[in-house]
Interface confidence: low
């Protein structure tokens, strides 16, 4: 995954910060649980090496993944996290690449994880350049 | 190590029907979906749709909405394709495959060997 | 329902040969592709996904490229077990569909 830079030059982003909100729940999700949920789905859903996820942030009700990977540690055939956050993009916003449907089915021991805003931050490798999406 | 077991082939009659069994091992089987695909001698490789494990539903392509059904038996970790009323167009190979991660599919990582159904009469 | 042509149905190679398989989409599928490789009386076995990740344990001879609704499938140098029925598949919406199948045979 690449981000166009003002010189045209294109670098591989190396740092994605998606900054999510879930609908209010009866309590906190449990922050092991919801971190061991997301690492599995980056890891099972997207093919993600979970070497590249960084962490897992929570404070009800926003929920911070940072996803990590300089050029050095990415080995052939890895996946990149440019691509895993674009298909996870997709799947919030109900337009999935791969699901039938109901979308994804995200849960925390049984209960359902629903987002309902996201922000996706993209981190290049060449300072200071930083560019910000906006999904609804 | 994961793998998909499918049951033997089938010799049937038209009109008959018949079940087929995809039993699932090696990992959970309630986090992917479970796919059908149809392959006609010579032919090539056709979805027939998909079940979701967590939740038993069934999600059919539209050729094969009527005489077919996804089931499960989850405690056995097993998935089932049954055709009822017999063509000779079912003569085929089924294949179960493994789809994608959560209640939906993907691509197809890990399929079984499949099962030969042939109707005649 | 979106169509997955494969233009060849049979591509003649010789061991040591580069070769490229094309499949074309009906309508843009972004990168949700995937190729599989299927020898006689044998099942289907996943080899790229997402136009161009290597599944696990595939050897890196196997690339696979492209988006929207052109995808390219190539073996850089072709090797004996390589001889089987190649066949694209679309996993951008349901219901899922794949090429027709391109089998690869020595010349």
């Known amino acids: 995954h690449t981000a166009a830079q003002d010189n045209d030059e294109l670098v591989r982003t190396h740092h994605i910060l998606i900054d999510l909100r879930h609908r209010p729940t009866a309590g906190a999700f449990n922050h092991s649980d919801l971190d061991a949920e997301l690492r599995r789905l980056f890891r099972e859903r997207y093919r993600l090496h979970p070497k590249f996820v960084a962490a897992v942030h929570y404070e009800q009700p926003t929920i911070q993944i940072e996803l990590r990977q300089n050029t050095s540690q990415k080995a052939a055939g890895d996946v990149d996290i440019g691509d895993a956050a674009y298909y996870f993009e997709r799947d919030i916003k109900g337009e999935s690449l791969f699901q039938g449907r109901g979308g994804l089915d995200l849960r925390v021991r049984g209960e359902p994880l629903q987002v309902e805003r996201t922000l996706i931050y993209y981190l290049d490798e060449i300072p200071p350049k930083f560019s910000m999406k906006r999904l609804t | 190590q994961i793998q998909l077991v499918q049951s033997g082939p089938e010799l049937k009659k038209p009109g008959e029907t018949v079940k087929i069994s995809c039993k699932a091992s090696g990992y959970t089987f309630t986090n992917y979906g479970m796919n059908w695909v149809k392959q006609a001698p010579g032919k090539g490789l056709k979805w027939m749709g998909w079940?979701?494990?967590?939740?038993?539903?069934?999600t059919y392509a539209e050729e094969f909405k009527g005489r077919f059904a996804f089931s499960l038996e989850t405690s056995a970790s097993t998935a089932y394709l049954q055709i009822n009323n017999l063509k000779k167009e079912d003569t085929a190979t089924y294949f179960c495959?493994?789809?994608?991660?959560?209640?939906?599919?993907?691509?197809?990582?890990?399929w079984g060997a499949g099962t030969t159904v042939t109707v005649s009469s | 329902d979106i169509v997955m042509t494969q233009s060849h149905k049979f591509m003649s190679t010789s061991v040591g040969d580069r070769v490229s398989i094309t499949c074309k989409a009906s309508?843009?599928?972004?990168?949700?592709v995937a190729w599989y490789q299927q020898k006689p009386g044998q099942s289907p076995k996943v080899l790229i996904y997402s136009a161009s990740y290597r599944y696990t344990g595939v050897p890196d001879r196997f690339t696979g490229s492209g988006s929207g609704t052109d995808f390219t499938f190539t073996i850089s140098r072709v090797q004996a077990e390589d001889l089987a029925v190649y066949y694209c598949q679309q996993h951008y919406i349901t219901p899922l569909t794949f090429g027709a199948g391109t089998k690869l045979e020595l010349k």
């Open positions: 309508q843009d599928v972004s990168i949700a």
């Open positions: 079940i979701n494990t967590k939740t038993g539903e069934p």
């Open positions: 495959g493994r789809g994608g991660y959560g209640s939906s599919y993907w691509y197809f990582d890990v």
